[in-house]
Interface confidence: medium
């Protein structure tokens, strides 16, 4: 793990990787790209899944936050032997199945998908891929696409959330390393701190939520600050302002001293949440303090 920038966001990260025949001689570059990127997501609350697709989609590693399982998943990924067609929609299907299942279990964790492909999709396969990506979005996912070599950028812009969610790699597979920093910067949504972190019991406050990526939402009007109080009740508040590195939010009035509110952020109106280890606590404030 080579220092440098990292992401502290707590969300579910899905890698959907093309293992069709055309990447046969470039699988090492794809693997090293994923391995280096995976090591940069360091929150203990971040879960990761590896999905590969060719003529069918396979979940190589189910969602896990266990670093040992992720290490083993990367070993399995390194052993993949590419071959077959580019059924990208099958990869999205495997991601949607997991997101759907997690939602059903009551885990409303935000999902980020990074899909990598190297070729243009034939019309009906593109149709299915766009449709399945929309299904993932419907379930709350943010979708990024990495296109290498012979990709069609217009297609990928429709599969991803927007043109800004596409990372074109025009100089071949060896150039994948060069986009790690920009992918990390764009795909990372993280909550780093809250100011103030201690508020007066029974009083109304505004909280500045510091972090990164808050404007990566498809629609910034759908960004919410969420306060999970004493691990039970969750209160969502619309921020007064949304900037990439901070949110200005009304804090809920917490009546008793010693109450704790864990901070979360939703990018999609409460459909799913980015978690953090940032806690706001209440204290007793005497008059005039």
């Amino acid at each position: 793990e080579d220092g440098g920038p990292a992401c502290y966001g707590g969300f579910d990260l899905y890698f959907i990787l093309d293992k069709s025949g055309s990447v046969l001689h470039h699988w090492n570059e794809i693997y090293y790209f994923v391995e280096q990127l995976a090591h940069k997501f360091i929150s203990p609350q971040l879960r990761m899944s590896f999905i590969v697709f060719s003529t069918r989609g396979t979940t190589l590693m189910k969602l896990t936050e266990d670093r040992e399982q992720i290490r083993q998943g990367l070993e399995e990924l390194q052993k993949v032997l590419p071959g077959g067609d580019t059924y990208m929609h099958e990869g999205f299907e495997r991601a949607s199945e997991q997101i759907y299942y997690e939602n059903r279990q009551g885990y409303r964790t935000a999902s980020v998908i990074i899909a990598l492909t190297d070729g243009e999709l034939h019309e009906d396969l593109f149709f299915y891929s766009e449709r399945e990506a929309n299904r993932s979005r419907d379930l709350g996912a943010i979708v990024y696409c990495v296109g290498v070599k012979d990709f069609n950028e217009t297609q990928l812009a429709r599969i991803a959330d927007s043109k800004d969610h596409v990372f074109p790699v025009n100089d071949g597979f060896q150039a994948l390393q060069g986009i790690i920093h920009s992918i990390l910067k764009k795909s990372c949504i993280e909550i780093l701190a809250a100011e103030p972190s201690t508020i007066c019991a029974g009083e109304s406050f505004q909280v500045v939520v510091r972090g990164n990526g808050f404007r990566h939402a498809r629609n910034v009007d759908r960004v919410l600050c969420s306060f999970k109080i004493n691990d039970s009740v969750t209160l969502n508040e619309k921020p007064f302002s949304v900037e990439d590195t901070y949110l200005l939010c009304p804090a809920p009035i917490l009546k008793e001293v010693g109450m704790k509110a864990a901070l979360q952020v939703s990018m999609n109106d409460g459909l799913s949440f980015i978690s953090s280890s940032v806690i706001i606590t209440t204290t007793h404030c005497s008059d005039g303090s």
């Epitope: 299907e93 019309e123 149709f127 766009e130 449709r131 929309n134 979005r137 217009t154």
Partner: antibody, heavy 118, light 107 residues
Amino acid sequence: EVQLQESGPSLVKPSQTLSLTCSVTGDSITSDYWNWIRKFPGNKLEYMGYISYSGNTYTNPSLKSRISITRDTSKNQYYLQLNSMTTEDTATYYCARYKTIDSSFDVWGAGTTVTVSS
Amino acid sequence: DIVMTQSPATLSVTPGDRVSLSCRASQNIRDFLHWYQQKSHESPRLLIKYASQSISGIPSRFSGSGSGSDFSLNINSVEPEDVGVYYCQNGHSFPYTFGGGTKLEIK
């Protein structure tokens, strides 16, 4: 409000070619997918195919090479051509919009009834 | 092609009845199943998408359920204006296919 309207002949002779037009208002055919669906006497619905926002087409293999779907973006119209018509092609022909976000046909034309008879 | 089978072919009901229309797919189509209503001399109208998602403007008495290969459309209190033919549609794979329809009649 999006509206679709089919137009074309109501009577076609066997072996002739059917040409239908779908005129779209309230949306551009350079977004989404634009379809043809037909309903046979007895209520059976058959999906015929689409032309996409980019001009690509998909056609039902059951219609083999008889079918062609084209468009004119300047008129915001798309077209159906069905060759070698037989009495089996007697049906009401609908044009419909399909959005991948919903994966369903959310807006339909009123339909035009075509009879194949000599 | 995926074959969609609807039952019953005809359903005769009394206003206020709760009815259930069935649709079966010949293979797993997840929840890519849509329901349409077609009244006499009108074009089909989308009622339910993705097996159970409601459509704005459609009365709340219409609901859908199911996933995989077995689906149902429920009307919890039939009204006289609900007469027509109800179709299910496979939205999973090409060529898209429709069920044969269930004709709803009022006694």
